[in-house]
């Protein structure tokens, strides 16, 4: 009789999971001296513990903690660049700018970006066929639970000016429900950062307006001038150019605005 | 087939510097991944790590140490040398080395058959 | 430094018995621990890592257990080769710190 299994309505755990966990886990160390202490065999006891055995709709902060231990890892602080909705300018922006660090920058960020995982409450497997979808189904999913832990202490950690990539191209460019609106900008700490500085990211080539000035970004000017941080706001007009600028600041193209 | 093999001088003095050499087989410096570390063990007693060195030349010291270690390798002759300063007598013991691989952090599969040093005036 | 601590020095045992040695952390280390077997005269032999990993070619009557501060190595059935000095180490963080021992011994 084959055995009932919840059918989820978001996409199973990604294939090969665990071998990939431990095959980047393995690439990091390699990439970054500073965590070649790192075991990634314990790295990965810790990442499955977290969600095997555990309803996929219970999981909490706590169940990632060994995890976050082992994970631990020190960038500097006034190099953080957070980003909502524009993950792939960001990660081209940090693999040019090596000083800078997002989140997929770290350890466990590498681990996890664009993987899904899940597993069954009472067995010891994983669930390829489908995991909780964050809105139809459940908020303390396995995923959606590990990105609000990393994100909230990728957050806390931040000093000085905090760089945020936003995506001008979105109808809500600053969205109060995204893990940035949600979690990273209300665990800034005031007696650290100075200044969130925000890059709007213009997506039409000949798009000249001062997205600085729209509705959601002055609600996220609002939100962070309450928490006692400074504000302030730049329209990137042409992403392309701007990259070329960060590969090569002495082009003489550079100095206009981008 | 993985094989180290530790050499040293066997005898030296007060204030010498102690210098060693891990010679190894099976196993290349020149590949992504791989480390030797150097331990030590005072005769009946118990084991003390001292330092590692990976392929792409990053070094670890014990920060006990430190200051006198000095940890190196000569990629195409399959060798890694430890220098230890201004030996004393509580330098005296069997001294190990053994490979060490990248996603294990610092576990130590394959060990040499040690080298004994006394340090006596 | 994360201090190792290997209760017993020495445990008394007899072949065929199963026996566990104990490894306490100063530090929580999660589960980065290694356990070696080392024999008069030779070198130590690398049997379990990140505590309940068995090394290849190790015998499966060699177990590795524990997490956080609290480790053990067990073996289910002793035998007469298996007389030796086991040590746990920490692969945690640098400095690595081994325990100081505990010599299994025949009663």
């Known amino acids: 009789v084959p055995r009932w299994r919840q059918q989820w309505s978001g996409p199973g755990t990604t294939k090969r999971f665990p071998e990939t966990v431990l095959a980047r886990c393995v690439k990091y160390t390699e990439i970054h001296p500073e965590m070649r202490h790192v075991d990634c065999q314990s790295v990965w006891d810790a990442f499955k513990g977290a969600f095997i055995s555990k309803h996929p709709c219970n999981i909490t902060e706590e169940d990632y903690q060994p995890l976050m231990k082992l994970g631990t890892q020190t960038v500097p602080c006034n190099k953080i660049l957070l980003w909502s909705r524009i993950k792939d300018l960001a990660h081209q922006f940090t693999q040019v700018q090596r000083d800078m660090f997002t989140l997929e920058d770290t350890l466990l960020g590498y681990l996890a970006d664009d993987l899904t995982w899940c597993g069954e409450f009472n067995t010891s497997k994983i669930n390829y066929q489908s995991c909780p979808d964050w809105r139809k189904d459940c908020s303390n999913n396995p995923v959606s639970v590990f990105w609000k832990t990393v994100s909230r202490r990728f957050a806390e950690a931040a000093c000085d000016v905090v760089h945020v990539m936003l995506n001008g191209s979105r109808s809500k460019i600053f969205d109060k429900n995204s893990t940035f609106g949600s979690v990273e900008v209300h665990n800034l700490q005031p007696e650290k950062v100075q200044t969130l500085e925000a890059w709007v990211i213009h997506g039409g080539r000949e798009d000249s307006r001062d997205l600085c000035q729209d509705p959601t970004i002055k609600e996220l000017e609002s939100i962070i001038s309450k928490r006692n941080i400074q504000f302030s706001c730049k329209n990137i007009y042409r992403p392309d150019k701007f990259l070329q600028c960060v590969k090569n600041p002495e082009d003489s193209s550079c100095t206009s605005e981008i | 087939q993985v094989t180290l093999k530790e050499s040293g001088p066997g005898i030296l003095q007060p204030s010498q510097t102690l210098s060693l050499t891990c010679s190894f087989s099976?196993?290349?410096?020149?590949?992504?991944?791989?480390?030797v570390g150097w331990i030590r063990q005072p005769s009946g007693k118990g084991l003390e790590w001292l330092a590692h060195?990976?392929?792409?030349?990053?070094?670890r010291y014990n920060p006990a140490l430190k200051s006198r270690l000095t940890i190196s390798k000569d990629t195409s002759s399959n060798q890694v040398f430890l220098k230890i300063a201004s030996v004393d007598t509580a330098d005296t013991a069997t001294y190990y080395c053994?490979?060490?691989?990248?996603?294990?952090?610092?576990?130590?599969?394959?060990w040499g058959q040690g080298t004994t040093v006394t340090v006596s005036s | 430094d994360i201090v190792m601590t290997q209760s017993h020095k020495f445990m008394s045992t007899s072949v065929g018995d199963r026996v566990s040695i104990s490894c306490k952390a100063s530090?929580?280390?999660?589960?980065?621990v290694a356990w070696f077997q080392q024999k008069p005269g030779q070198s130590p032999k690398l049997l379990i890592y990140?505590?309940?990993y068995r090394y290849t070619g190790v015998p499966d009557r060699f177990t590795g257990s524990g997490s956080g501060t609290d480790f053990t190595f067990t073996i289910s059935s002793v035998q007469a080769e298996d007389l030796a000095v086991y040590y746990c180490?920490?692969?945690?963080?640098?400095?690595?710190?081994f325990g100081a021992g505990t010599k299994l011994e025949l009663k």
């Open positions: 053994a490979r060490i691989e990248l996603g294990r952090s610092y576990v130590m599969d394959y």
């Open positions: 099976g196993l290349s410096l020149s590949t992504s991944g791989k480390g």
């Open positions: 060195i990976w392929w792409d030349d990053d070094k």
């Open positions: 530090q929580d280390v999660i589960t980065s």
């Open positions: 990140s505590a309940s």
């Open positions: 180490q920490q692969h945690y963080t640098i400095p690595l710190t």
